[in-house]
């Protein structure tokens, strides 16, 4: 991974594009920390394992988070 100690935040660009929950392998929410003062959301896609930085402020991404958490709560006993 092209990462040096001087890199503070993971995302160079962020995307507003809606993501189909069915095409998601994984959704990571990285809270703000001493290294990066903002929340970062990284979607790993099933296709080729592509990772995409998402805009936490985007309406489409907020809806995605809701859909994913709803799906998770359905699955948990």
């Amino acid at each position: 991974v092209p990462l040096s100690r001087t890199v503070r935040c993971t995302c160079i660009s962020i995307s507003n594009q809606p993501v189909n929950p069915r095409s998601l392998e994984k959704l990571e929410i990285i809270p703000a920390s001493q290294f990066c003062p903002r929340v970062e959301i990284i979607a790993t896609m099933k296709k080729k394992g592509e990772k995409r930085c998402l805009n936490p402020e985007s309406k489409a991404i907020k809806n995605l988070l809701k859909a994913v958490s709803k799906e998770r709560s359905k699955r948990s006993p």
Partner: antibody, heavy 124, light 109 residues
Framework: QMQLVESGGGVVQPGRSLRLSCTAS????????MHWVRQAPGKGLEWVAV????????FYVDSVKGRFTISRDNSKNTLYLEMNSLRAEDTAIYYC?????????????????WGQGTTVTVGL | EIVLTQSPGTLSLSPGERATLSCRAS???????LAWYQQKPGQAPRLLIY???SRATGIPDRFSGSGSGTDFTLTISRLEPEDFAVYYC??????????FGPGTKVDIK
């Protein structure tokens, strides 16, 4: 459509300064990392600098470290390159380029939108 | 620092022929970090391929990318007149820096 327009190039004496600007339109500028890439006459492409979408990180090629500064004003949809202590070897066409949507340190989507470039000539 | 080498320096072909361009890295590069660009005289570069094999938006399917580790290839299945240009590979490496190869010129035979 998505567009980048560079300005600020010109002829300058060695040791002097110049500030390049790149104005973006047709996309949400504040969402994308931005680069400066240069091309000396008759030569290949050389990456110069990158700035994260929110200005959180900035990185430079070794040959310009300490002389060039990349910055951005998201309220004006504008990217800048402050060039100090210019040398003859800085003579080139300078392009600004947009980092692809969603790029991060784990996956790179390439520089997907380019300006037409502005020419910088350093000479006596 | 990873150095990219492109071969051949110049490729002389006719329209309709297949072009195979090589990009070799001095150390292993993740395919997630490899891109290809096309540049025509007097124009800005254009992104063709990212992630070693994914076509950028609007790029015709005659362009394809492949490879992993230190060896990557850009293939143009059937050269069209507008494909004669210089092609650059590029990698995103640690620090982070974004290195371009020296380019391959595809010209008309």
């Amino acid at each position: 459509q998505m567009q980048l327009v560079e300005s600020g190039g010109g002829v300058v004496q060695p040791g002097r300064s110049l500030r390049l600007s790149c104005t973006a339109s047709g996309f949400t500028f504040s969402n994308n990392g931005m680069h400066w890439v240069r091309q000396a006459p008759g030569k290949g492409l050389e990456w110069v600098a990158v700035i994260w979408f929110d200005g959180m990180n900035k990185f430079y090629v070794d040959s310009v470290k300490g002389r060039f500064t990349i910055s951005r004003d998201n309220s004006k949809n504008t990217l800048y390159l402050e060039m100090n202590s210019l040398r003859a070897e800085d003579t080139a066409i300078y392009y600004c380029a947009r980092e692809g949507d969603g790029s991060g340190i784990y996956y790179y989507y390439g520089m997907d939108v380019w300006g037409q470039g502005t020419t910088v000539t350093v000479g006596l | 620092e990873i150095v990219l080498t492109q071969s051949p320096g110049t490729l002389s072909l006719s329209p309709g022929e297949r072009a195979t361009l090589s990009c070799r890295a001095s150390q292993s590069v993740s395919s997630s970090y490899l891109a290809w660009y096309q540049q025509k005289p007097g124009q800005a570069p254009r992104l063709l391929i990212y992630g070693a094999s994914s076509r950028a938006t609007g790029i015709p399917d005659r362009f394809s990318g492949s490879g992993s580790g230190t060896d990557f290839t850009l293939t143009i299945s059937r050269l069209e007149p507008e494909d004669f240009a210089v092609y650059y590979c590029q990698q995103y490496g640690s620090s982070p820096i974004f290195t371009f190869g020296p380019g391959t010129k595809v010209d008309i035979k």
